[in-house]
């Protein structure tokens, strides 16, 4: 699978969409898990309605939920309130007993916002103390991993 | 192909209004951020204002130096992008260009329109 | 954004080094980015955008523009300088207050 980048913007919201061929995962429920390091497990962070023809209506988890067309083939996360936190690498899978077969892997890259500084407190190096001035940016949106680029962001 | 057309520029006395409108195509204008920047000799470019999407409330930000007088809206159902301008002053003379943020990467400005000539003068 | 110099008067095939200062630090450390971009207006256009993230050119912009820099210094190179290339050059900050510099004016000598 390759990896494809949704971009969002801290304190904002951002949607990422995995499309999935509908007849092949008929039936099938979906999940939002976050990849523990390179090779680790894929934490489950929400997954679709108990009864699959339900899939269509929205569950939370936190700040994270998750929504399926299945008619459409189109399962859609919401990540409110964006966080550097939030940053890594996901996978939506679709669920068949106690397997799950990868639809996608994502990586989230969390961008700083220029309009909206109430959670400013990341942006400067430590000593620095600057005043922000006035402001702008985006939306969520996505690209695919370019080979050689590396899927897990730096720590700082 | 992506594609800004911005409509509603000309000549208006200070104190007076002016809604400007920039109607896109070549993408999902409703996923779309869309901005308005202005380019004048005395203060070269300068952001306006910001329109966010459906996801993020529609939210609006604008530049201190419009903030009151300038309201940015939008219209997904015609792709189209607004900008209204109320008590006009002589230093908001300049070409506005509608910009789009739809491209696969965040917060730079991808895509220009031709831009339309807003001239306030008496 | 303090952009120098203001006007530059080159050849075709010469290298050209454009600055740009920042006041502040654009370095975003959660995402190790430089939020920078560059751009090209030719006249009578509207801008186009060469280089995003200080250093990821745009595609389809030629591989002579290079932009490099870190923190708060920022340098576009055009390493031989073509005849459509004359034009302003303006870097953007985007990191806090969407701010653009005053451009560098690249004309024919």
């Known amino acids: 699978h390759n990896t494809t980048v949704f971009q969002g913007v801290a304190g904002q919201s951002l949607q990422v969409s995995c499309p999935y061929d509908s007849m092949k995962h008929w039936g099938r429920r979906k999940a939002w898990c976050r990849q523990l390091g390179e090779k680790g497990p894929c934490q489950r962070v929400v997954s679709t309605h108990n009864l699959w023809l339900l899939s269509f209506l929205r569950r939370w988890n936190g700040s994270t939920a998750i929504t399926d067309d299945t008619l459409g083939g189109t399962l859609t996360i919401t990540l409110r309130n964006l966080q550097p936190h939030d940053a890594g690498l996901y996978q939506c899978q679709s669920l068949h007993g106690s397997e799950a077969d990868t639809l996608r892997k994502v990586l989230v890259e969390v961008l700083a916002d220029p309009l909206d500084h109430r959670d400013a407190g990341d942006l400067w190096f430590p000593g620095e103390s600057e005043s922000f001035e006035d402001a702008h940016v985006e939306h969520s949106i996505s690209r695919s991993l370019l080979e050689g680029e590396i899927p897990f962001p730096p720590t700082s | 192909e992506v594609k800004l057309e911005e409509s509603g520029g000309g000549l208006v006395q200070p104190g007076g209004s002016m809604k400007l409108s920039c109607t896109a195509s070549?993408?999902?204008?409703?996923?779309?951020?869309m901005d308005w920047v202005r380019q004048s000799p005395e203060k070269g470019l300068e952001w306006v204002a910001e329109?966010?999407?459906?996801?993020?409330?529609?939210?609006?930000y604008y530049a201190e130096s419009v903030k009151g007088r300038f309201t940015i809206s939008r219209d997904d159902s015609k792709s189209t992008v607004y900008l209204q301008m109320n008590s006009l002053r002589t230093e908001d003379t300049g070409i506005y260009y509608c910009?789009?943020?739809?491209?696969?990467?965040?917060?730079?400005?991808?895509?220009w329109g031709q831009g339309t000539l807003v001239t306030v003068s008496a | 954004q303090t952009q120098s110099p203001s006007s530059l008067a080159v050849s075709a095939g010469e290298k050209v080094t454009l600055s740009c200062k920042s006041s502040?630090?654009?370095?975003?450390?959660?995402?190790?980015?430089?939020?920078l971009a560059w751009y090209q207006q030719k006249p009578g256009q509207s801008p186009k955008l060469l280089i995003s993230?200080?250093?990821t050119r745009e595609s389809g912009v030629p591989d002579r523009f290079t932009g490099s820099g870190f923190g708060t210094d920022f340098t576009l190179t055009i390493s031989s300088v073509q005849g459509e290339d004359l034009a302003v050059y303006y870097c953007?900050?985007?990191?806090?207050?969407?701010?653009f510099g005053a451009g560098t004016k690249l004309e024919l000598k």
């Open positions: 502040q630090s654009v370095f975003y450390s959660s995402n190790q980015k430089n939020y």
């Open positions: 993230w200080a250093s």
């Open positions: 329109i966010r999407n459906k996801v993020n409330n529609h939210a609006t």
């Open positions: 953007h900050q985007y990191l806090s207050s969407l701010t």
């Open positions: 910009t789009s943020l739809y491209d696969g990467y965040y917060l730079r400005f991808a895509y």
């Open positions: 070549g993408f999902t204008f409703s996923d779309a951020w």
